[in-house]
């Protein structure tokens, strides 16, 4: 806390300029008017104040705006944003995407801080949904942003926003998240032709049901093994050997290297060994000839 002292003669700030950087902390407190600071916030970020000095300026703004800063001030916080606590940010009402971008720029290249997470939360809640422009902005700064949201939060993403999503944005998504995103992607890309559609939908396929995988197998898509390995096990199990062969195309040979890993391992256990042998890959573990497979889950459903 800076001790309150009278401003020395001739040192009263008439405007926010570079001379203030050479003021001691107590001089900043005594000689800079909070209202002047608020109206000239755009100049503050152009002056490389130390964080100690920024503490003093923050204190002045906190006194002027105890209920939270107006957006005109927030937009120009610059490095001062790094001094804000999540509690400070919860008092804000940020509606402009330009303000959001300006603050994210300050934190660019670093992991998402609690301050940034709070800011984004306030912004998205204020907008009511995660629209395309917001998603574009957030994934540009934080590629993993989408996968940090809960399935409930993802449900507010309109299908039109899916166009902003890049494959790397989904790298850390789990199946529950992809279950929510896949139907939106399917809707967003529904008017594209076969090969273009597959390129766009590929990263979302971890949420695809069996019937969609069956449909894709009829389109010569040549799915790579990395994508296949991310598919839902329950969606892969009902696929026939012929369907998997069509789905993977030339990549089918990669099944051998993955035969001990899910979903390939579980899928092999469900196939007839005769059918697996037709692939010529030496896959082992299928159902021996002459054995009858009873689907007990289906039987329970019928009774």
């Amino acid at each position: 806390e800076v001790e309150k002292t009278a401003c020395p003669s001739g040192k009263k700030a008439r405007e926010i300029d570079e001379s203030l950087i050479f003021y001691k902390k107590w001089e900043l407190e005594a000689c800079v008017d909070a209202a002047l600071l608020a109206t000239q916030m755009d100049r503050v970020n152009a002056i490389p104040f130390t964080y100690e000095q920024l503490d003093v300026l923050k204190h002045k703004l906190d006194e002027l705006y105890p209920q939270g800063y107006p957006e005109s001030v927030i937009q120009h916080l610059g490095y001062l944003f790094l001094k804000m606590s999540p509690e400070d940010i919860r008092k804000w009402n940020v509606t402009s995407l330009e303000t959001l971008k300006a603050l994210l720029e300050v934190n660019k290249g670093h992991e998402m801080s609690p301050q940034v997470a709070t800011l984004i939360d306030r912004f998205v809640k204020g907008r009511g949904q995660l629209d395309k422009d917001t998603l574009d902005t957030l994934t540009a700064f934080y590629p993993g942003y989408l996968c940090s949201l809960s399935p409930e939060e993802l449900s507010s993403v309109p299908p039109s926003s899916i166009w902003a999503v890049r494959p790397q944005d989904l790298d850390t998504c789990d199946p529950r998240q992809l279950d929510v995103l896949y139907p939106k992607a399917r809707l967003a890309f529904q008017n594209m032709n076969g090969s273009e559609y597959f390129v766009k939908i590929q990263s979302f396929l971890g949420g695809a049901p069996t019937e969609d995988l069956k449909a894709l197998s009829q389109q010569n898509v040549s799915m790579d093994l990395a994508t296949f390995m991310k598919l839902r096990t329950d969606a892969v199990l009902p696929l026939t050997v012929a369907e998997v062969q069509k789905l993977l195309g030339p990549h089918v040979e990669g099944l051998k290297a993955e035969e001990r890993h899910r979903p390939v391992r579980d899928w092999i256990l469900r196939q007839r060994q005769d059918d697996l042998d037709t692939l010529g890959l030496g896959l082992q573990g299928g159902i021996p000839n002459g054995y009858l497979v009873l689907d007990l889950s289906m039987q329970e459903a019928l009774s």
Epitope: P48, T50, Y51, E52, L54, Y79, L82, K83, V106, G109, H110
Partner: nanobody, 117 residues
Amino acid sequence: EVQLVESGGGLVQAGGSLRLSCVASGRTSTIDTMYWHRQAPGNERELVAYVTSRGTSNVADSVKGRFTISRDNSKNTLYLQMNSLRAEDTAVYYCSVRTTSYPVDFWGQGTLVTVSG
């Protein structure tokens, strides 16, 4: 995060020169602005000069025309060239940095400059 070590201080005659150095280590890629401060016995610390990552620099009025600040990013080193030294320049000189990643100033231990007579 960032460690700073100053050197180059010592005893010098009034009118003489010294060159202070400050070497930064650690997460130096996050350094934005680098500063020289000083604290004379019985006085509070004051900012002497700064230089930003873009090369913009400035010095306090009390040392203008006598002190020059510079920075060599390839060596992660900050310099303060002090000419025409006066008795009132006697102080412990500290280097500090502002980074883009963490909202605190990082400080060195300081180097003592004594100007006699």
